[in-house]
Interface confidence: low
């Protein structure tokens, strides 16, 4: 199972409370908006999704210089005032995960179970390997349920 430490290592939390759209990896809690206020000064406008502040705002009402996040490595999925992008999620093959949708500058990686793996909780921290049946299959493994096996000595249909 993914530990809090390993999940947090994949995420730079910039954050989100009250902002549009939705985010977060399972173990990351919602915090107050970071980067809105700096040394008593406000940025006039946030950076758009896919970008970050290049420098801190130094004059009240200053407009930030925004630069793109690193494609394939970082993203921000909402307007924000931070000088950091989020790190793209890694789909850990060792935990039975693979990439469904690659990370872009505006959307985090989407993971799914690898073939022959399943997860019967809808918020998955890892996927389990499908059971291999010795005496025949009643029901194939799916993304959300394990294989159902025939018991030894049960008659075939």
């Amino acid at each position: 199972r993914l530990s809090s430490k390993s999940v947090n290592a994949q995420v730079t939390d910039i954050n989100s409370k009250g902002l549009e759209l939705r985010k977060t990896v399972t173990t990351v809690e919602t915090q107050n908006l970071e980067g809105l206020h700096h040394d008593g000064q406000f940025c006039h406008k946030p950076c758009p999704p896919g970008e970050r502040k290049a420098r801190d705002c130094t004059v009240n009402g200053d407009e930030p210089d925004c630069v793109p996040c690193q494609e394939g490595k970082e993203y921000t999925d909402k307007a924000h005032f931070s000088s950091k992008c989020r790190r793209c999620r890694l789909c850990d093959e060792g935990h039975g995960l693979e990439v469904e949708i690659n990370c872009t500058r505006t959307q985090n990686t989407k993971c799914r179970c690898k073939p022959n793996f399943f997860c019967n909780s809808t918020v998955c921290e890892h996927c389990d390997p499908c059971t291999k049946c010795e005496h025949g299959i009643i029901k194939e493994c799916t993304l959300t349920s394990n294989t159902k096996c025939k018991e030894e000595g049960s008659r075939s249909n």
Epitope: T24, L97, K110, V123, C124
Partner: antibody, heavy 122, light 107 residues
């Protein structure tokens, strides 16, 4: 602005098949699960099942033998078929979108269709 | 299936009151609970996800808490538009299931 528009037959006889379609206008189609929910008159909400753009489905076990949810990505349509209907299937049927990915806890049926009233009566 | 039980089933309150609705799961669902508001003849509206995260555009007088089996929805100061029926929903495991609803009425 995302909108969900539903249509389908509103009056059915017992043993017939309920068929509803939900059209998605605007927004992303591929990054959501598309869900069907029903609400019998004067009662609570019942989750029927969901589908994503790849055709991966999850169904309520109590309806699984009778229900099929399918997707037409060329039209951004989601359809619901429920066979062998009885009076107990009389309800307001909603389609809705929900975002949930492996490793994420963010979820909410945040956009809903207008609902379709289905009555089963002989 | 996981059973979701809401209490109370109905509740009378006045504008300005603080109101708490509880939802109990028949087995642990971690934090994977959502709250919805439904007004007569309208589709439900998502208020809270992941037990305590506010959906975009929802007023801050709504808050959620809890984990495991016991959850609460609190409205800190009731407004006239808050009189409605509220539902909880678990999404820890399939099938997703809803509570039976709590009807919040004007006293």
């Amino acid at each position: 602005q995302v909108q969900l528009q539903q249509w389908g037959a509103g009056l059915l006889k017992p043993s017939e098949t309920l068929s509803l379609i939900c059209a998605v206008y605007g927004g992303s189609f591929s990054t959501y699960y598309w869900t069907w929910i029903r609400q019998p008159p004067g009662k609570g909400l019942e989750w029927i099942g969901e589908i994503n753009h790849r055709g991966t489905t999850n169904y309520s076990p109590s309806l699984k033998s009778r229900v099929t949810i399918s997707v037409d990505t060329s039209k951004n349509h989601i359809s619901l078929n429920l066979t062998s209907v009885t009076a107990a299937d009389t309800a307001l049927y909603y389609c809705a979108r929900g975002l949930l990915w492996i490793g994420e806890g963010d979820y909410g049926l945040d956009v809903w269709g207008q609902g379709t009233t289905v009555t089963v009566s002989s | 299936d996981i059973q979701m039980t809401q209490s109370p089933s109905s509740l009378s309150a006045s504008v300005g009151d603080r109101v708490t609705i509880t939802c109990r799961a028949s087995q642990g669902i971690r934090r994977w609970l959502a709250w919805y508001q439904q007004k007569p003849e309208k589709a439900p509206k998502s208020l809270i996800y992941a037990a305590s995260s506010l959906q975009s555009g929802v007023p801050s007088r709504f808050s959620g808490s809890g984990s495991g089996t016991d959850f609460t929805l609190t409205i800190s100061s009731l407004q006239p538009e808050d009189f409605a029926t509220y539902y909880c929903q678990q999404y820890n495991s399939y099938p997703y299931t809803f509570g039976q609803g709590t009807k919040l009425e004007i006293k």
